[in-house]
Interface confidence: low
C-alpha cells in the first residue's frame, strides 16, 4: 500500500471540523500580473503581497501595481495600494525587506524615461506607512541593507555609480564611479570592483578591488588584476589574473583584504569559473570548473585559513549554461551536504557527505521502494535526489529538497530509486536521520513544507488540474490525512509559510478561472487546534545524531564531537511552539588521524590515514609554493579539520619542515596596496 495508508495509521480525531474553523479565504478582486509575497520581520505575522510587472510592458493593459498587507499570517488582507500612490513596482527589484526585525521595506518604482532618477517607497514600521523618495540616480540593482545597520543602504546606478545612504534611503551620495560589483562586508565595510578603461565587461580581469570602512570617506585599493570577488563566512575571495597568461587564480584574505594568500587551488582559464558553494566561519566548499564545456568540475574543501584545499568530490555537476548545481546544505543535521555528479556515461547520480565533504557516498535505497529501469541490478540501487538541475530541465519536480535547522534530522526531497536520476515522474522521500535512511513519503510530485519545527508536514499534489485538497502528517510523514479546504478547486500556484518553520499557519495560493475572469485567492489554514496541547518532557526522546551503532565508543563522532538531541516522538501530537529551541548535548571525541587534513606539500596515500610529504611539487602545488606566503610553507604536515573539536587521542606532532626551501616569491606586492581619500 502507499505510505501512510496503513490501517494502524494514527489518525487525528475530528480534524476536519478543527481545520474548517481555522481556514480563512481571501479573494483578491483586482490582482493582475505576477504576484510576489514577502514576510516582514520574524514572528510578526506581517505579509506583503505585491503585483509587479516586467519593464518594458504595455502597462495600460493591466492598470497599476497592487499592494496588500496582512498582519495575521495571511488570514486577512488589506489593500494598501494608496500608500504607494498607485505606482508601478518593478519585478526585478521586488520588495527589499530589511534584516532581522528592523521592520524596514523598500519598494523600487518604475518611472517614466525622461526623469532625472528613480523612485522608492520606504517603510520602517512593518509596511504600515510608506514615504515616497525620488532618487538622484536610476537604480541598476535592488537596495542592499548593511547587515549591521539597516539604516545604511547601498545601490548601483545604471551609470555604474556606487551610491550610499546613511538614513534609510532619505538622502543619497555617490561615493564612487565606474563600479561593477559591490557587497557589504562585516562592520559596515563595503567591497567593490572598479574599471579604469571602458566598462565592466571590457576590463574583466583588469578590475581593481576597493574597500571603504567609513561609508565612502576614504578608500583602499586591496587588489589589482581582479576578475571577480566574493564573500563567504569570514573569507574574502578574489579571482586574480596571472601575470603570464589568461588564467586566473583564487586569492583569499581573512582580514578584510589587508593581506592576501594564494589559495592552493588549480588556476582556471577564460571559459572556466570558480564558485563558492558554501562557506561558514570555519571553512569553505569551492567548486572549480573543468576545462571545456563539460558541465562538471571538482569540489575542494578548505582548511581554517581558506588556503590549503583537499579534493572532496570529482565530476561535480555544475552546468555552465544555466549555472545550475544541486549542491544542498542539509541544515537539519550538522556536516551533511547533498549534490549530484555527472558519471562517465553522462547519467546524473546523487552523492551525500555526512562529514562536511570528507567522504561522499550514494544515498541508501529506501526500504519501501523498488529499483527502477535505470538499475542494472534490481536488488542494488540508490536514491537519487532531484534538485535545481532537474527543475531547470523542466522535469516534473515542483520543489527542491527541504530541511530546517529546528526540525532536526528531517530532509524531504523528490527522487527516484535506481542507478541514476530518472526522467520519470518522481516520488517524494523523507529522511528522519539527516540523510542516512530514507522512506517513500508520497506517491508522485508534491509541494511540501514543514510547520511547528517538524511537528507537522504539509503537502499538496503537483497537478495541472485545479485542486482543493491538502495533506498533512503529524508523525514525520509516516501517516497522512487529507483535508478539503474549499468546495471550488483552484489552480494552485504556491504554498507560503513563514520562514523558519516555526509557524502553524500555511497559505495556499492560486487562482480561479471562469469564462471571462480569473481571480487570485489565498486560503490560510491554522493547525493550532490539530496540535491541541503544548509538548511536555514525555513527548521527547533522546536521539544520537550520525549514530548507527550506539554501542560503538566512536560512533556518531563527526568533526571531533557527537551530539544527542531531544526530538519529538513520532506518536506525540502536540505543539513544539514558536519558542521551541533545539536541545542538544555534545560530547567531545578522542582525536584520530581522520580529524586532521594534510597540510600543503603533504598527501594521503590510498588507504592510509597518515600524511606523507610530496616528493616533488608539481602543477598548482608548485605555483602555490612559488607565490604562497612564507608562513604557510612552514608545516608539520597536519592541520586540524576546520570546526573539528576532538580532544586527546592522536596528536600527530612531528618535525616542522620549511617547504620554502623548495621555492620562493610572493603575491600582492606592497606597492600595489595604495590608499587614498575622497
Amino acid at each position: 500500500s502507499a505510505p501512510g495508508e496503513d490501517e494502524e495509521c494514527g489518525r487525528v480525531r475530528d480534524f476536519v471540523a478543527k481545520l474548517a474553523n481555522n481556514t480563512h479565504q481571501h479573494v483578491f478582486d483586482d490582482l493582475r500580473g505576477s504576484v510576489s509575497l514577502s514576510w516582514v520581520g520574524d514572528s510578526t505575522g506581517v505579509i506583503l503581497v505585491l503585483t509587479t510587472f516586467h519593464v518594458p510592458l504595455v502597462i495600460m493593459t493591466f492598470g497599476q501595481s497592487k499592494l496588500y498587507r496582512s498582519e495575521d499570517y495571511g488570514k486577512n488582507f488589506k489593500d494598501i495600494t494608496d500608500l504607494i500612490n498607485n505606482t508601478f513596482i518593478r519585478t526585478e527589484f521586488g520588495m527589499a525587506i530589511g534584516p532581522e526585525n528592523s521592520g524596514k521595506v523598500v519598494l523600487t518604482a518604475e518611472v517614466s524615461g525622461g526623469s532625472r532618477g528613480g523612485r522608492i517607497f520606504r517603510s520602517s514600521d512593518f509596511a504600515k506607512n510608506f514615504v515616497q523618495t525620488d532618487l538622484p540616480f536610476h537604480p541598476l540593482t535592488q537596495m542592499m541593507y548593511s547587515p549591521q545597520n539597516s539604516d545604511y543602504l547601498l545601490a548601483l546606478s545604471t551609470e555604474n555609480g556606487l551610491w550610499v545612504s546613511k538614513n534609510f534611503g532619505g538622502k543619497w551620495e555617490e561615493i564612487h564611479k565606474a563600479v561593477c560589483l559591490a557587497k557589504w562586508g562585516s562592520d559596515n565595510t563595503i567591497f567593490f570592483t572598479t574599471y579604469a578603461n571602458g566598462s565592466c565587461k571590457a576590463d574583466l580581469g583588469a578590475l581593481e578591488l576597493w574597500r571603504t570602512s567609513d561609508l565612502g570617506k576614504s578608500f583602499k585599493t586591496i587588489g589589482v588584476k581582479i576578475y571577480s570577488f566574493g564573500l563567504g563566512g569570514r573569507f574574502l575571495f578574489a579571482s586574480v589574473m596571472a601575470d603570464k597568461d589568461t588564467t586566473r587564480r583564487i586569492h583569499v584574505s581573512t582580514d578584510q583584504g589587508d593581506t592576501w594568500s594564494m589559495a592552493q587551488l588549480p588556476s582556471v582559464g577564460q571559459e572556466q569559473f570558480y564558485s563558492i558553494l558554501a562557506a561558514n566561519d570555519d571553512m569553505v566548499f569551492m567548486h572549480v570548473d573543468e576545462p571545456g564545456d563539460t558541465g562538471f568540475g571538482t569540489i575542494f574543501t578548505s582548511d581554517d585559513r581558506g588556503i590549503v584545499y583537499s579534493k572532496s568530490l570529482d565530476r561535480h555537476l555544475y552546468t555552465t549554461t544555466g549555472g545550475e548545481t544541486d549542491f544542498t546544505n542539509v541544515t537539519s543535521l550538522r556536516g551533511v551536504y547533498i549534490t549530484s555528479v555527472l558519471s562517465e556515461d553522462n547519467s546524473i547520480q546523487t552523492m551525500i557527505t555526512f562529514d562536511q565533504g570528507g567522504r561522499w557516498t550514494h544515498l541508501r535505497k529506501p526500504e519501501n521502494s523498488e529499483c527502477d529501469a535505470t538499475a542494472k541490478n534490481k536488488n542494488e540501487c540508490s536514491l537519487h535526489i532531484h534538485a535545481s538541475y532537474s527543475i531547470s530541465q523542466k522535469l516534473n519536480v515542483p520543489m527542491a529538497p527541504l530541511s530546517e535547522p529546528n526540525a532536526v534530522g528531517i530532509v524531504i526531497a523528490h527522487g527516484s530509486v535506481g542507478d541514476a536520476i530518472s526522467v520519470m515522474v518522481p516520488d517524494v522521500y523523507i529522511s528522519d536521520d539527516g540523510g542516512y535512511s530514507w522512506t517513500k513519503m508520497l506517491e508522485g510530485p508534491h509541494y511540501y513544507t514543514i510547520l511547528d519545527s517538524g511537528g507537522i508536514i504539509v503537502a499538496i499534489e503537483h497537478s495541472s488540474r485545479p485542486i482543493n485538497v491538502i495533506k498533512f502528517s503529524t508523525d514525520e510523514g509516516q501517516c497522512w490525512q487529507t483535508y478539503t479546504f474549499t468546495r471550488d478547486p483552484i489552480y494552485f500556484t504556491g504554498l507560503a509559510s513563514e520562514p523558519g518553520a516555526r509557524s502553524m499557519n500555511i497559505s495556499i495560493w492560486g487562482f480561479t478561472e471562469s469564462f471571462l475572469t480569473s481571480q487570485w485567492v489565498s486560503y490560510t489554514i491554522d493547525f493550532k487546534d490539530i496540535l491541541e496541547r503544548n509538548c511536555e518532557e514525555k513527548d521527547y526522546t533522546i536521539w544520537a545524531a550520525h549514530s548507527t551503532d550506539p554501542e560503538d565508543y566512536e560512533d556518531g563522532c563527526i568533526l571531533g564531537y557527537k551530539e544527542q538531541f531531544l526530538r519529538l516522538r513520532k506518536s506525540s501530537v502536540c505543539q513544539n511552539g514558536r519558542d521551541y529551541v533545539v536541545t542538544k548535548q555534545p560530547s567531545i571525541c578522542l582525536c584520530s588521524l581522520e580529524d586532521f587534513l594534510c597540510d600543503f606539500g603533504y598527501y594521503r596515500p590510498e588507504n592510509d590515514s597518515k600524511c606523507v610529504e610530496q616528493p616533488e611539487l608539481k602543477g598548482h602545488d608548485l605555483e602555490f609554493c612559488l607565490y604562497g606566503r612564507e608562513e604557510h610553507l612552514t608545516t608539520n604536515g597536519y592541520r586540524k579539520i576546520p570546526g573539528d573539536k576532538c580532544q586527546g587521542g592522536v596528536n600527530p606532532v612531528r618535525e616542522v619542515k620549511d617547504l620554502k626551501k623548495k621555492c620562493t616569491s610572493n603575491f600582492l606586492s606592497p606597492e600595489k596596496q595604495n590608499s587614498k581619500s575622497n
Epitope: 554501542e551 560503538d552 565508543y553 560530547s587 578522542l590 586527546g648 587521542g649 592522536v650
Partner: antibody
C-alpha cells in the same frame, strides 16, 4: 558484575615476547575502549595504549611503538596485549583497564574498571 | 608529552585530617584530569574524572577541583581505608600521562 580477569604471571627471557589476555564480563565488550597500563616495581603508572574493541583501531604510546600489539577477540570478549623484544626494564605489573564511557558531556576518558594485573618478569 | 607533576610525593596524616594533593600539568589540559587511588598489590581505582566529577560508588569526602594546569584532590576527613598512593592522569592529549604519585601514610 563488571569485571576484567587477566592471565597469570609470566617469566620471560630478554628478547622474547609476552602476550597478556584480559577477559571482560558483565558489560558490552565492544562498547568501551580497553587501555593497557603498566607499573614497574616501586614505580608509578605508565600508559601503553588502547584498542577500540568494536573497530580494532589502536593507539600506542610512542615509547612502545613497534614493540606492542593490541588485539581483541570479540567472540570471547577478550583483549590481548603482546610486547616483543623484551628487556629487563619491561619487568612490571601489566593492567588492562576499561575506558570510562563518554555518554553525554565529555568525561575525560578516565579508566573506571581495572583488571587484577599480570606480573611479567624479564630475566636471563 | 605532557608532564604531570604531583606534590607532595608523600605525606603523613592522621584519621580525620583534611588532606590536599596537587597536580600540575606542563601545559593546559582544560579539565581533562582524573584521580586514582592505589593500595599495595592492588589495581588502581578511579575516584574523580573530568577534574571534579565523583565516580559512582566513591565516598563524597573525596573531591576534585581545578582546570587548565593546576588541579587539587581533597579528602575532607581522612579515614583509615584512605591510606594509599594517589595518582593524577591527563587525557587531553595523547599519550595519556600519569603523575608520579602521592603516598598518604599514617602519622
Amino acid at each position: 558484575q563488571v569485571q576484567l580477569v587477566q592471565s597469570g604471571a609470566e617469566v620471560k627471557k630478554p628478547g622474547a615476547s609476552v602476550k597478556v589476555s584480559c577477559k571482560a564480563s558483565g558489560y558490552t565488550f565492544v562498547a568501551y575502549y580497553m587501555h593497557w597500563v603498566r607499573q614497574a616495581p616501586g614505580q608509578g603508572l605508565e600508559w601503553m595504549g588502547w584498542i577500540n574493541p568494536n573497530s580494532g583501531a589502536t593507539r600506542y604510546a610512542q615509547k612502545f611503538q613497534g614493540r606492542v600489539t593490541m588485539t581483541r577477540d570479540t567472540s570471547i570478549s577478550t583483549a590481548y596485549m603482546e610486547l616483543s623484544r623484551l628487556r629487563s626494564d619491561d619487568t612490571a605489573v601489566y593492567y588492562c583497564a576499561r575506558g570510562k564511557r563518554s555518554s553525554g558531556w565529555y568525561e575525560g576518558y578516565g579508566m573506571d574498571v581495572w583488571g587484577q594485573g599480570t606480573t611479567v618478569t624479564v630475566s636471563s | 608529552d605532557i608532564q604531570m607533576t604531583q606534590s607532595p610525593s608523600s605525606l603523613s596524616a592522621s584519621v580525620g585530617d583534611r588532606v590536599t594533593i596537587t597536580c600540575r600539568a606542563s601545559q593546559s589540559i582544560s579539565s581533562y584530569l582524573n584521580w586514582y587511588q592505589q593500595k599495595p598489590g592492588k589495581a588502581p581505582k578511579l575516584l574523580i574524572y573530568a577534574a571534579s566529577s565523583l565516580q559512582s560508588g566513591v565516598p563524597s569526602r573525596f573531591s576534585g577541583s581545578g582546570s587548565g594546569t593546576d588541579f587539587t584532590l581533597t579528602i575532607s576527613s581522612l579515614q583509615p581505608e584512605d591510606f594509599a598512593t594517589y595518582y593524577c592522569q591527563q587525557s587531553d592529549v595523547s599519550p595519556i600521562t600519569f603523575g608520579g604519585g602521592t603516598k598518604v601514610e599514617i602519622k
